[in-house]
Interface confidence: low
Amino acid sequence: HHHHHHEQKLISEEDLGGEQKLISEEDLRAPRCRELPAQKWWHTGALYRIGDLQAFQGHGAGNLAAPISGLKGRLDYLSSLKVKGLVLGPIHKNQKDDVAQTDLLQIDPNFGSKEDFDSLLQSAKKKSIRVILDLTPNYRGENSWFSTQVDTVATKVKDALEFWLQAGVDGFQVRDIENLKDASSFLAEWQNITKGFSEDRLLIAGTNSSDLQQILSLLESNKDLLLTSSYLSDSGSTGEHTKSLVTQYLNATGNRWCSWSLSQARLLTSFLPAQLLRLYQLMLFTLPGTPVFSYGDEIGLDAAALPGQPMEAPVMLWDESSFPDIPGAVSANMTVKGQSEDPGSLLSLFRRLSDQRSKERSLLHGDFHAFSAGPGLFSYIRHWDQNERFLVVLNFGDVGLSAGLQASDLPASASLPAKADLLLSTQPGREEGSPLELERLKLEPHEGLLLRFPYAA
């Protein structure tokens, strides 16, 4: 059953006695294949947020202001990242803090025209990249939801959902919903419109909150809502705390499909030191749910390294000319171009992880079991039926240490073998493909390992 699924019938002796059937001994021995879950496109890989289209374009060709058409030229790059959806914008007209001058149906001409957008949708469709539109109304203003005119704004959102669904978008995002009065009921209504149009459409809500109770109350009345929050950014970047956050979340949400990110909009570098970026990439791609990244996360884009750049939307570094403001500020290894040519780069790691995430059954929809390991470590298994299984071991700490994997925590269906093959390490120097003895496994500081092993009956 490796990488495929077919229906198998359980056959009783009675069946055999009656009608003559050609059934081999192997057929009788083979356990029944587990039925595949229904998977939507956002279950199959990562989402990629482009909150500021002008910053994404880079400064190379001047301060670019029709970036929707420029984005079309970057779709091949997004395909190379194997991301499944693009979360775009907001791109609608919004005069800051002015409800009357906020039109969710009109594209701000600084971003391009409707013809640019239609063309982008068509091109993205051809490349199997879905487009999710951010409709956060007052994105240029103080309060994203114009706190005093909630009903007016909610009506505008409703109209916009219907309009953009007709226009062919694949989903929507609304952020800062902690500022939206009666958020749960509005989200339920917007979810109904979105899903009423097609079950294949997605609604993402974002909140700055990291409080599990607040998050649960938003999820409670909204099944299938994908929620991004600051929940994981509270981990203090320690293994034990991250493990407890992840397992608490999965338990509290009843293992419903979720998304994983460190915030609703910001870059990983806003929360993490450079040495933990690889570890977090590995974790986000291998937890059960949809990983959500911001443009630049794949190269470790860091606003702090670019003088004068806004923290929330630094310029994307395509090559060394992307930030001409200060000559020499950008070295090749900070850019897409430079990292594309380096198999050991963060970008290369991102591409490999994204590829695995989008094709391996155990990572696509496999069960998740966390288990005990050495101090500062977070380790878990992903497995699905008789497909290849994955073991993830993450060392958040500053010191190298033995993995100390406590396999006794695991259920019988997810037991550990004596050896597993190294698929990849976040650090250089290990021989990929080599079998590692799990009892003797040691990890370098900040190292994450992705190991694979076969199903054994």
Partner: antibody, heavy 125, light 108 residues
Framework: QVQLVQSGAEVKKPGASVKVSCKAS????????MHWLRQAPGQGLEWMGW????????NYIQKFQGRVTMTRDTSISTAYMELSRLRSDDTAVFYC??????????????????WGQGTLVTVSS | EIVLTQSPGTLSLSPGERATLSCRAS???????LAWYQQKPGQAPRLLIY???SRATGIPDRFSGSGSGTDFTLTISRLEPEDFAVYYC?????????FGQGTKVEIK
């Protein structure tokens, strides 16, 4: 307000080239495609193609391919249209134009709303 | 490409009269993307109607547009002296964008 100001009239000999400029003001130059059109004396309007000032991408109609080059200089918010190997039947007024995005009853629209004043190019031996 | 044919070529009318101009397309045009322009001698065209029937900003309400598919009409309900000019229809729904050959509205 939006203004498109074109360069002055030109007289050219057959086989020569002409380069017409169109300086934009009153809006973000790189935010809109610039379209070029021509109108022979006493004739109708003919669309030649566009340039995306943002990226420099161009789209020319087949009739002009190989003879027309549209460029831009974002630092001075100016678009250019160069027509080479001129013939006498290229005598025309050339216009640059920009769309305006309208929205009504659920439909976006982008007709050519803003036009330059036109540049007369006379090709004569 | 879509060919637009305008009729009549010339329309001779007096001020105060109603003018009806026709534009026929060689294949169906999305009514969302049909425009009408007015051009006076020595001037650039001026947008009157877009989306077949919506008046552009600042255009008086004596100008109206209608039609769908392949047949479109521009109507000037009461001609004013300043309305005597050449009128062009244009489709911008599919590339290449094309114009009709124009209808001249002249004073009788």
């Amino acid at each position: 307000q939006v203004q498109l100001v074109q360069s002055g009239a030109e007289v050219k000999k057959p086989g020569a080239s002409v380069k017409v400029s169109c300086k934009a003001s009153g809006y973000t130059f790189t935010g809109y495609y610039m379209h070029w059109l021509r109108q022979a004396p006493g004739q109708g309007l003919e669309w030649m193609g566009w340039i995306n000032p943002n990226t420099g991408d161009t789209n020319y109609i087949q009739k002009f391919q190989g003879r027309v080059t549209m460029t831009r200089d974002t630092s001075i918010s100016t678009a250019y249209m160069e027509l080479s190997r001129l013939r006498s039947d290229d005598t025309a007024v050339f216009y640059c134009a920009r769309i305006r995005v309208y929205y009504e009853s659920g439909i976006y629209n982008y007709p050519l709303h803003h036009w330059g004043q036109g540049t007369l190019v006379t090709v004569s031996s | 490409e879509i060919v637009l044919t305008q009729s009549p070529g010339t329309l001779s009318l007096s001020p105060g009269e109603r003018a009806t101009l026709s534009c026929r397309a060689s294949q169906s045009v999305s009514s969302s993307y049909l425009a009408w322009y007015q051009q006076k001698p020595g001037q650039a065209p001026r947008l009157l109607i877009y989306g077949a029937s919506s008046r552009a900003t600042g255009i008086p309400d004596r100008f109206s547009g209608s039609g769908s598919g392949t047949d479109f009409t521009l109507t000037i309900s009461r001609l004013e002296p300043e309305d005597f000019a050449v009128y062009y229809c244009q489709q911008y729904g599919s590339s290449p964008w094309t114009f009709g050959q124009g209808t001249k509205v002249e004073i009788k």
